[in-house]
Structure formats: structure tokens, C-alpha cells
Amino acid sequence: KNLKSPQKVEVDIIDDNFILRWNRSDESVGNVTFSFDYQKTGMDNWIKLSGCQNITSTKCNFSSLKLNVYEEIKLRIRAEKENTSSWYEVDSFTPFRKAQIGPPEVHLEAEDKAIVIHISPGTKDSVMWALDGLSFTYSLVIWKNSSGVEERIENIYSRHKIYKLSPETTYCLKVKAALLTSWKIGVYSPVHCIKTTVENELPPPENIEVSVQNQNYVLKWDYTYANMTFQVQWLHAFLKRNPGNHLYKWKQIPDCENVKTTQCVFPQNVFQKGIYLLRVQASDGNNTSFWSEEIKFDTEIQAFLLPPVFNIRSLSDSFHIYIGAPKQSGNTPVIQDYPLIYEIIFWENTSNAERKIIEKKTDVTVPNLKPLTVYCVKARAHTMDEKLNKSSVFSDAVCEKTKPGNTSK
């Protein structure tokens, strides 16, 4: 009896794993084996496909074959017993085009109200993605174990932190990779679950701001309790995108280790030009807070985007504010050669109720004030460039009293 050639051959490629599956043509014939040949583009001869010779099952793995993943390849299969079937040719394919991205590896760290997610490609040093390894982005689905309501987060990198979670709650998530340059979406990782910890008695520091004074950076933050020590760490922002890079390690700022105030001062030359992330942690000697939310810090912008300087002319029912260029050390004005908008905050000295004005002009009127009342004003500058999207810190507050009634002219 003539053997029929196998049919319906499927090629599955996940990362560097090449799997072939096929159907037997004749289930009634026993002890049949199967063999594959392959042919590269521009070649006439067929070569035996190692790992896929004399296979008794309907699946084989040819991952060991060192192929150019961008080069088209053709396969053929036949059945063998005493005699052989005719060859069945599989449509030619390019491995890279056919490949799927495998499930990434995921490592989770729990805080009380946040989870840190570290993601790395499932196949280390993959041949398939050798040219694209740094272009991976990831997306994840997260849900509370108790509710199952899913939230999707797109376009994250190899380290991501999810905030505003509940303490002592189990969250589950799964992650998949994508190569947007090749329009490839990967396979989800297994589900990983982690329980957030009990609420930390020490909250993380908040409202971290960087300003420039003379040749130094001044880092300030807010903290709930007194008699604490703080440490500050930094990281190159671009390293967050680079999975497994050993430079991706938070480093101490020496002048900000174990400081006992809610600020620290360090020389500008600590950082070369670039964009950094900064974070702060508090300790009372016995306990340690979790890390603060990270702030982005761009040395280029930070060096130039200083808080505005302004003068106030007081009337009975308004202030006229004249904004000038900020002063650098030595009282020389700084030339800001990009358009700015100004945020002006003012409040009655005896009240906490703040009002805000956003203005592009450098002369601003603050209307609807009460006569003979002390008002305080502070201002900051924002770049109008969407790409930069930076803000200076607020200027120091200036307080002035409005004039008596009927002096509005």
C-alpha cells in the first residue's frame, strides 16, 4: 500500500523555539516515521532537517538549526515505513516574520500601596530578537484577586511601578511583550500574584523638588514626622528601558546619605548632562519607609529653568505683577531662549485658600482684591514646548498689602 504524505504542516516559532506540527494522513497505518528536509533561498539542493528525522510523533523541534532568521526557508515532509510517501512541500516562510514573542519573565516586589514590576525577555540573548531586544515594550493586565476586575496598562518598560493600591491585598497580573517596530504582539506570561504588605508606619517622602542655587542642586521634600534620616538615590532614566543592564542600579547621592533634614545640597557636577530619576527614603533608626514616587530630573532644563523674579505694584483692588528674568549667581539675569508660561499663585495672608492665574505675558494683573489686606504671591515658569514640558520650582512668596479704597488708578 502506498504511503500518503502528511498534510497540514504548521510552523510555530516562539522566540528561538522552532516547532513543527502535522497531521498523519492515514491513522490506520502503524509504525510510520516522518522526516523533514529544508531548503534555503537560492539553493537547489535539499538538506536533512536535524532534529526532525525519523520522528514517530507528529511534532518536532528544529531550534538547534542555526538559521538566518531574516532569510526565507522552505520545508518538505514525507512519511516512511518500508517505503516512503511522496514529499509534501510547506509554503516557504521567513522565520522572523512568522515568529511570536514568547512570554516575558516577571519579578514582583510588594510595598504597602504599590507593586514594582521587573520584566525581562523570556529568552536570554535571543537570536530572533537580537536586533530588536532594546525595542521591547510591555503591556500588562492587573486585577485584585478578590474582584477580578481587570485594568490594562500599555507601553511600559522593563521596570514599572503601580501606585495607589490597597495594603494587605493580593493583586494578580500577566505581562506580554510587543515589538512595535515589527507590529508584533507577544504571548502573555503566566499569572503572577503578590500580596501588598501591611501599611508602613512611615509613609514615603512626598513632593520632591529640585532647584538650582549657585553651582549646587538643592533637593527638597516633605515629610510627616520629625527626627528622621533620609537617603536619596538616582538612576539614569534611559536605563529603565534597558532590561537586565547592570547599570540599571539605583545609586546613592553621597551628599544625601543619612541626611537629617528634608533637603540636601549637592554639586551640579555630580550629574553629567542627561535625564535622571530621583527617589527618597525615610528612616527613624528602627523602621524604614518604602521609596517615594520617582521624580524625573533633566539637568539641561533644571540648569536653565529657574523660578521667575517679579515686582508687585499694589493698588486697592488689584496687584500689577511685572515678571523679569531670573537671576543667576552674581545677580546676572538668565536669558531664557524658549517661550514660557507663568503660573501665579496668590492668597490672603490669613487664609489658606489659594487662587491661580496662568499667563503668557510678563505683566499680569491680579484682580478682585480687598483693600488694606495682605496678599502673598509666588510664581513659577513652565516651558511651552510639549516635548520638554518642564517647570521651575516656585519662587519664594512675596507678601504685599493692598492700598486703601479708591486708588485703583
Partner: antibody, heavy 123, light 107 residues
């Protein structure tokens, strides 16, 4: 698979130093902290310190700061602990153990251990 | 330094027993707790990290629980191969510290 290889025994004279090795394989050596742990005969485990093989940052247990010096040789994926001025109190098994990823936000557990080197201080 | 206290230094147990070993930290350690098993002449083996996560290859009869300062290791049905000394260890705060160990002996 992850392996940490340590020599089995070292016999040292009192007052002498000794340098113990720990050769790592099966993982990216520069991506994980490398810990050292002491276990004296019939006693429990005591953490000596840890080193980041990527940049040789070290965290010591203050108790061992003057006794132990941690180093690494990245080219051979080997970590070392040098113990100085040995006394009978230093007779113990010294283990190396892989710690958490150096790029994690918080410390991780020691998941892989060497078999330990037994140090005997005797004249 | 954070002190780790294992209340029982030894347990006399029968095969098939359910067993719970407790560990108390002197400060809150936010689930940064590991459990190790050590047999004579061998290195410690990590059983559980993060207070509750079973390591790959560890039998499912082992489980961990707890939070804040109090943690437990449970063995649902004791087997001969479980006879060993068990240590807890905190890795929240440097220096990392171990409990003094709990030794299991067969009755």
C-alpha cells in the same frame, strides 16, 4: 543551572589570613548580589555581608567589618572573602549565596547556596 | 539590628504530623522573610521567600504565612525527608538576620 562552587576545607594557623573563593555559573554574575554567611559548629547562621559584582559595592554586617573583606573577579565569575587574623572563634563553615537582583528596589532572598568551605583554625 | 526569634529550638514529631514553626521579628519586616531547611553537612535550602512564596521544586506540603512581625512555616504532613533544622531570616533591613533555628526530631 545556577551553581556556586566552593572548596571543601581550609586549615589555617592562628593569626594568619585566609581567602575563600566562590565560583558562580549558570546565571549572569553581575546581575545579582553575592552574600556570605558564617555557621560556627553546632550554631546558627550569621550574615557577614554582600557584594554587588557589577561595581563592587559592599554592605557589611558591622560585626564582621574588621574581620572580612569581600571582593570579586568579574572575568572569572568568582567572589572572594578574605578573613584576617584568624582565631579559633573564626572556625566555621563559610557559605556564599546568591541574593536578589541588583536592579531590584529592595533586597531579595538568598536563593542559591554554595556547599560551604569549612575553615579550621588550629596550630 | 532586627532580632529574629524562633520560639522552639526543637520539636519531637511523628511522621504524618502537621507542624507549625513560628518566627517573630523585633520590628515590622513587611513580608521580607525567608524560610530555609538545613540537613546535617549540607548548605541551607531556600523553601519560601516573601513570607508565602514557595520556591520551585519545594513540595506543596510546605507553606508560609504571616505579616508584620509574626510569621509561620507549616508542614501539612511530615515526611522522613523533612527531618532537618529550619531557619527563618529577614531581608528587610541590613544586616540580614536569622532565627536561631528549629530542629525536628522523629519521636
Amino acid at each position: 543551572q545556577v551553581q556556586l562552587q566552593q572548596p571543601g576545607t581550609e586549615l589555617v594557623k592562628p593569626g594568619s589570613p585566609v581567602k575563600l573563593s566562590c565560583k558562580a555559573s549558570g546565571y549572569t554574575f553581575t546581575s545579582f548580589w553575592l552574600n556570605w554567611v558564617q555557621q560556627r559548629p553546632g550554631r546558627g547562621l550569621e550574615w557577614i555581608g554582600k557584594i554587588d559584582p557589577s561595581d563592587s559595592e559592599i554592605r557589611y554586617n558591622q560585626k564582621f567589618k574588621d574581620k572580612a573583606t569581600l571582593t570579586v573577579d568579574k572575568s572569572s565569575n568568582t567572589a572572594y572573602i578574605q578573613l584576617s587574623s584568624l582565631t579559633s572563634e573564626d572556625s566555621a563553615v563559610y557559605y556564599c549565596a546568591r541574593g536578589g537582583g541588583i536592579y531590584y528596589d529592595y533586597d531579595g532572598a538568598m536563593d542559591y547556596w554554595g556547599q560551604g568551605t569549612s575553615v579550621t583554625v588550629s596550630s | 539590628d532586627i532580632q529574629m526569634t524562633q520560639s522552639s529550638s526543637s520539636f519531637s514529631v511523628s511522621l504524618g504530623d502537621r507542624l507549625t514553626i513560628t518566627c517573630k521579628a523585633s520590628e515590622v519586616i513587611y513580608n521580607r522573610l525567608a524560610w530555609f531547611q538545613q540537613k546535617p553537612g549540607n548548605a541551607p535550602r531556600l523553601l519560601i521567600s516573601g513570607a508565602t512564596s514557595l520556591e520551585t521544586g519545594v513540595p506543596s506540603r510546605f507553606s508560609g504565612s504571616g505579616s508584620r512581625k509574626d510569621y509561620t512555616l507549616s508542614i501539612s504532613s511530615l515526611q522522613t525527608e523533612d527531618v532537618a533544622t529550619y531557619y527563618c531570616q529577614q531581608y528587610w533591613s541590613s544586616p540580614f538576620t536569622f532565627g536561631s533555628g528549629t530542629k525536628l526530631e522523629i519521636k
